[in-house]
C-alpha cells in the first residue's frame, strides 16, 4: 500500500494509472466503500462522500490513462485509505494528513515560550524536527516547546514530520515582538538636544498599545515617569508628560523622543515599556544618557561626565594637537593653571572617542570662551 503524507489546508493529488493509455472506466472510493468520484465517458461524477465539494480529478489526463484524485483544503479526518478501481485492478493509497500549529499566536513577545503542536491522525506515530531561523534544531513528538524566545528566533521555522519513512515539511512564520536593541546609550554635551529612538524589530499591519518611559536620574534617589503615551494603528499620542524635562514625542513609528537639552540632572538611565493590545507582558528597551560638561573656574579647567559610564571609559583633557595632559578612568578630570589655547575634553573607549567638548582658554588677563 502506497503512503502519502498531506498537510492540513493543502491540496493533495493521489495518482491512479491504468495500463491502457486511454480514458476508461474508473472510480475512487474510501475505506468505507463510499464512492468519491468516477467518470462517465469524458464527464466526472461525484459520489456522496464528505469530500464531495473538495474532491476533483484532472479530466485532461484521463486520455493518457491517468485518473488522479485531488483533495483540496485537507482536513486531519481525510486521513484514510483511498481505493482507485480501474480496469479490473485496485490501487490503494493511504493518506495521512498532519497539521502543525503554534500554541496561541505566531506573534510572541521576546522572552515568551513558543509551543508547536502536531495534529495527527489516530494510529500514526510521527516524529517532528524543527529548525529555527538561527539554525537551532529541536525534536519532539506531538508538542515541541522553545522557552525564552530571542529576537533571532523571528522568521520562518521549518518543521519536518516523519512517518513511514515519508516526510512532510511545514513552514511557520514566527514574529518575535521586541525592540531592535535591548539597550542604547546616548552621549551628549551639556545643552545639546537629545534624540532617543526606539525602533521595533517587527512590522505588523496594525499596532495598538500603550507605553511609558521611566527615568532614573543619577542624581535622584528614585525613578520618575517622564512620559506616557498611546499607540493606535501606528499613530502615537501623548497622554501625560512631566514639566521638567518637557519631552516631545513623534507622532509616527519608530517611537521617537526629544529632550530639549542635555543637563547633568537628566543624566541617568530610563526604561521604555510598551504594552501591546491582546498580548500579555511588555516590551522593554533601556536607554542611557551620558552628559559632558567642560568648565574653567579661576585657574582650574574641569571636565565632568554624568550618567552610566563603564569603568573602562577614559576621560581626558588635552590641548589641541598635543598629548593628553590628564587621562583617567574617572568621571571628572581637571588641569590647574591651563595654558592658553583650545582644550579638548574627550570621553573614549579603547581609543574610540564617544564624546568631545572643546573649551577655549584665553591668556590669564581674559575670561574663557566656550564655543
Amino acid at each position: 500500500k502506497k503512503v502519502v503524507l498531506g498537510k492540513k489546508g493543502d491540496t493533495v493529488e493521489l495518482t491512479c494509472t491504468a495500463s491502457q493509455k486511454k480514458s476508461i472506466q474508473f472510480h475512487w472510493k474510501n475505506s468505507n466503500q463510499i464512492k468519491i468520484l468516477g467518470n462517465q465517458g469524458s464527464f466526472l461524477t461525484k459520489g456522496p462522500s464528505k469530500l464531495n465539494d473538495r474532491a476533483d480529478s484532472r479530466r485532461s489526463l484521463w486520455d493518457q490513462g491517468n485518473f488522479p484524485l485531488i483533495i483540496k483544503n485537507l482536513k486531519i479526518e481525510d486521513s484514510d485509505t483511498y481505493i482507485c478501481e480501474v480496469e479490473d485492478q485496485k490501487e490503494e493509497v493511504q493518506l495521512l494528513v498532519f497539521g502543525l500549529t503554534a500554541n496561541s499566536d505566531t506573534h510572541l513577545l521576546q522572552g515568551q515560550s513558543l509551543t508547536l503542536t502536531l495534529e495527527s491522525p489516530p494510529g500514526s506515530s510521527p516524529s517532528v524536527q524543527c529548525r529555527s531561523p538561527r539554525g537551532k534544531n529541536i525534536q519532539g513528538g506531538k508538542t515541541l516547546s522553545v522557552s525564552q524566545l530571542e529576537l533571532q528566533d523571528s522568521g520562518t521555522w521549518t518543521c519536518t514530520v516523519l512517518q513511514n519513512q515519508k516526510k512532510v515539511e511545514f513552514k511557520i512564520d514566527i514574529v518575535v515582538l521586541a525592540f531592535q536593541k535591548a539597550s542604547s546609550i546616548v552621549y551628549k554635551k551639556e545643552g545639546e538636544q537629545v534624540e532617543f529612538s526606539f525602533p521595533l524589530a517587527f512590522t505588523v499591519e496594525k499596532l495598538t498599545g500603550s507605553g511609558e518611559l521611566w527615568w532614573q536620574a543619577e542624581r535622584a534617589s528614585s525613578s520618575k515617569s517622564w512620559i506616557t503615551f498611546d499607540l493606535k494603528n501606528k499613530e502615537v499620542s501623548v497622554k501625560r508628560v512631566t514639566q521638567d524635562p518637557k519631552l516631545q514625542m513623534g507622532k509616527k513609528l519608530p517611537l521617537h523622543l526629544t529632550l530639549p537639552q542635555a543637563l547633568p540632572q537628566y543624566a541617568g538611565s530610563g526604561n521604555l515599556t510598551l504594552a501591546l493590545e491582546a498580548k500579555t507582558g511588555k516590551l522593554h528597551q533601556e536607554v542611557n544618557l551620558v552628559v559632558m560638561r567642560a568648565t574653567q573656574l579661576q585657574k582650574n579647567l574641569t571636565c565632568e561626565v554624568w550618567g552610566p559610564t563603564s569603568p573602562k571609559l577614559m576621560l581626558s583633557l588635552k590641548l589641541e594637537n598635543k598629548e593628553a595632559k590628564v587621562s583617567k578612568r574617572e568621571k571628572a578630570v581637571w588641569v590647574l593653571n591651563p595654558e592658553a589655547g583650545m582644550w579638548q575634553c574627550l570621553l573614549s573607549d579603547s581609543g574610540q572617542v564617544l564624546l568631545e567638548s572643546n573649551i577655549k582658554v584665553l591668556p590669564t588677563w581674559s575670561t574663557p570662551v566656550q564655543p
Epitope: H27, K29, G38, K46, P48, D88
Partner: antibody
Framework: QVQLQQSGPELVKPGASVKMSCKAS????????INWVKQRTGQGLEWIGE????????YYNEKFKDKATLTVDKASNIAYMQLSSLTSEDSAVYFC???????????WGQGTLVTVSA | DIVLTQSPASLAVSLGQRATISCKAS??????????MNWYQQKPGQPPKLLIY???NLESGIPARFTGSGSGTDFTLNIHPVEEEDTATYYC????????TFAGGTNLEIK
C-alpha cells in the same frame, strides 16, 4: 447497436426477495457503468444505484442500500439487482440504464415490472 | 441530495407552437465548464428517452426541435414547433453528484 434486455415481470409475496437481470449487448460490457432506476405507477423516477462493471463495485442511493444488492457477471455481460424484504412499496417498474457520451442515461432496458401482493 | 423543481407540472400547447419547461436545482450543477443537467421524454409503457445531455447537447437521433439551455441552477427545455408525437412526460435530471436525482416531471399535451 447497444441493447439492454431485462428479465420478465415478477409477482412476489410480501417479505420475499426477487432477483432481476439486465443483459447487455452491442458494446464492451466492462467499459460502462450499469445504473438501476425505479418508477412506481404514475410516479417519478428514482435512482437506486450503480455497478462499475469493470471492478464489480456497487454504490447505492442511501434510501435503497438495505433494499437492493447489485452484482455483475462479467463473463456473460449480465447485471443483476436483488430486492429483499419486499413490501407493497416496492411494487414498481425497475429499469437498468447505461450512460452515453454524456452523463445522461442514453440507453435503457425495457423495464421489469415487480408486483408485491399476498 | 440535490432537489430539482420542474415547472409547470402540466402544459397544453397548440400544434406548431413553443413549449417551454423549466427546471431549478437546489444547488449549482456546474463543474469545469459543463452543466450536469439532462432532459428526458417518457411515453406511457416505455422507458425514458434521453433528449438533451449536459444542459444543451442534443442526443443523437433527437430532432433539432428540442433545445436545452441554462447553467448553474436554472435550466430550460424548449420544443418548437411542437408536434403531435411530443405528447409525453418530460423530466430533468442532474448527474452532478450521487445520487442522481430527477424532478417530478411535466405532462405536455398538444392541443
Amino acid at each position: 447497436q447497444v441493447q439492454l434486455q431485462q428479465s420478465g415481470p415478477e409477482l412476489v409475496k410480501p417479505g420475499a426477495s426477487v432477483k432481476m437481470s439486465c443483459k447487455a449487448s452491442g458494446y464492451t460490457f466492462t467499459d460502462y457503468v450499469i445504473n438501476w432506476v425505479k418508477q412506481r405507477t404514475g410516479q417519478g423516477l428514482e435512482w437506486i444505484g450503480e455497478t462499475y462493471t469493470g471492478s464489480g463495485s456497487s454504490y447505492y442511493n442511501e434510501k435503497f442500500k438495505d433494499k437492493a444488492t447489485l452484482t455483475v457477471d462479467k463473463a456473460s455481460n449480465i447485471a443483476y439487482m436483488q430486492l429483499s424484504s419486499l413490501t407493497s412499496e416496492d411494487s414498481a417498474v425497475y429499469f437498468c440504464a447505461r450512460r452515453g457520451k454524456g452523463t445522461g442515461f442514453a440507453f435503457w432496458g425495457q423495464g421489469t415490472l415487480v408486483t408485491v401482493s399476498a | 441530495d440535490i432537489v430539482l423543481t420542474q415547472s409547470p407540472a402540466s402544459l397544453a400547447v397548440s400544434l406548431g407552437q413553443r413549449a417551454t419547461i423549466s427546471c431549478k436545482a437546489s444547488q449549482s450543477v456546474d463543474y469545469d465548464g459543463d452543466s450536469y443537467m439532462n432532459w428526458y421524454q417518457q411515453k406511457p409503457g416505455q422507458p425514458p428517452k434521453l433528449l438533451i445531455y449536459a444542459a444543451s447537447n442534443l442526443e443523437s437521433g433527437i430532432p433539432a426541435r428540442f433545445t436545452g439551455s441554462g447553467s448553474g441552477t436554472d435550466f430550460t427545455l424548449n420544443i418548437h414547433p411542437v408536434e403531435e408525437e411530443d405528447t409525453a412526460t418530460y423530466y430533468c435530471q442532474q448527474s452532478y453528484e450521487d445520487p442522481p436525482t430527477f424532478a417530478g416531471g411535466t405532462n405536455l399535451e398538444i392541443k
